[in-house]
Interface confidence: low
Amino acid sequence: KGMHAAQPAVVLASSRGVASFVCEYGSSGNAAEVRVTMLRQAGSQMTEVCAATYTVEDELAFLDDSTCTGTSSGNKVNLTIQGLRAMGTGLYICKVELMYPPPYYVGMGNGTQIYVIDPEPCPDSD
């Protein structure tokens, strides 16, 4: 059976294009190695936004050039996506994989609808 993953239904990005939400998975949080992947669903197409692996001891670490940052505690992962624009509005799905030790489990959240509203450009001022 699949592993349960929970995430909020809706999140509004900040005016700077930053959105944060928590993804929790229904296991112990004691897996030696956990992989978290953020997927964006647009229509029938699913694309990977970012991914990171963390361990019991080490903090969640996305690549330096990633649009995501995050922290982890137990079976809770705090995810932040940066650089969002209005065209980035969509359903963002949290995928969690318990990589090690066996057995392998994977869980997918129902998705978080992130709404991004581009700020109105400021009028030029002399």
Epitope: M3, G29, N30, A32, T55, E57, S73, P101
Partner: antibody
Framework: EVQLVQSGAEVKKPGASVKVSCKAS????????MDWVRQAHGASLDWIGN????????SYNQKFKGKATLTVDKSTSTAYMELSSLRAGDIAVYYC?????????????WGQGTLVTVSS | QIVMTQTPLSLSVSPGEPASISCSAS?????MHWFQQKPGQSPQSLIY???ILASGVPDRFSGSGSGTDFTLKISRVEADDAGVYYC?????????FGTGTKLELK
């Protein structure tokens, strides 16, 4: 049948150390973390930390860092918890415990407990 | 850390009567787990993942709740139910247990 059998009661002098063992049987030892829990007399349960027997990586409750050290011996499927610089406040029953499974994780299996007494 | 507060601290119930124990978490948790401990014994798993009965636990026991408020209910208390009940969260480290509720029979 999953079994966790702990070492017997210990009486130690203040300042000494004690090493409590937890021998696991009935499952593949390296597949599950081993957690340790403390219970002082008449008190609630306190999570000490856990160890992954495969990687030997540990996670501690900040409260017990420097007090408890968790180790394993994979060859004998035994987990150990060493308590250092013992004092009266360390008098308690110590339990090893294991998850029921990796999907719905909860402490399903418990050792019988080891009473540690500190007395001069 | 997440602090778990149980109420009541103790309760005395007549056999056949219902009993209810509440557990309040200082911040939101995904699941609540419940344990029963009898004098001189190790804790035993009662309910895990908020509402799933552990193996061998009679269906007189039930668990419910979400967020910060969770409840353990016994529909009809029996003599064998006497003991101390603890809730536990595993949402974030350090894992924490509730203060405990002692159930006595009248």
């Amino acid at each position: 049948e999953v079994q966790l059998v702990q070492s017997g009661a210990e009486v130690k002098k203040p300042g000494a150390s004690v090493k409590v063992s937890c021998k696991a049987s009935g499952y593949t030892f390296t597949d599950y973390n081993m957690d340790w829990v403390r219970q002082a007399h008449g008190a609630s349960l306190d999570w000490i930390g856990n160890i992954n027997p495969n990687s030997e990586s540990t996670s501690y409750n900040q409260k017990f860092k420097g007090k408890a050290t968790l180790t394993v011996d994979k060859s004998t499927s035994t987990a150990y918890m060493e308590l250092s610089s013992l004092r009266a406040g360390d008098i308690a029953v110590y339990y090893c415990t294991r998850d029921g499974n990796r999907y719905d994780a909860w402490f399903a299996y418990w050792g019988q407990g080891t009473l540690v007494t500190v007395s001069s | 850390q997440i602090v778990m507060t149980q109420t009541p601290l103790s309760l005395s119930v007549s056999p056949g009567e219902p009993a209810s124990i509440s557990c309040s978490a200082s911040s939101s948790v995904t699941y609540m787990h419940w344990f029963q401990q009898k004098p001189g014994q190790s804790p035993q798993s009662l309910i895990y993942s908020t509402s799933i009965l552990a193996s061998g636990v009679p269906d007189r026991f039930s668990g419910s709740g979400s967020g910060t408020d969770f409840t353990l209910k016994i529909s009809r208390v029996e003599a064998d139910d006497a003991g101390v009940y603890y809730c536990q969260q595993r949402t974030s480290y350090p894992l924490t247990f509730g203060t405990g509720t002692k159930l006595e029979l009248k």
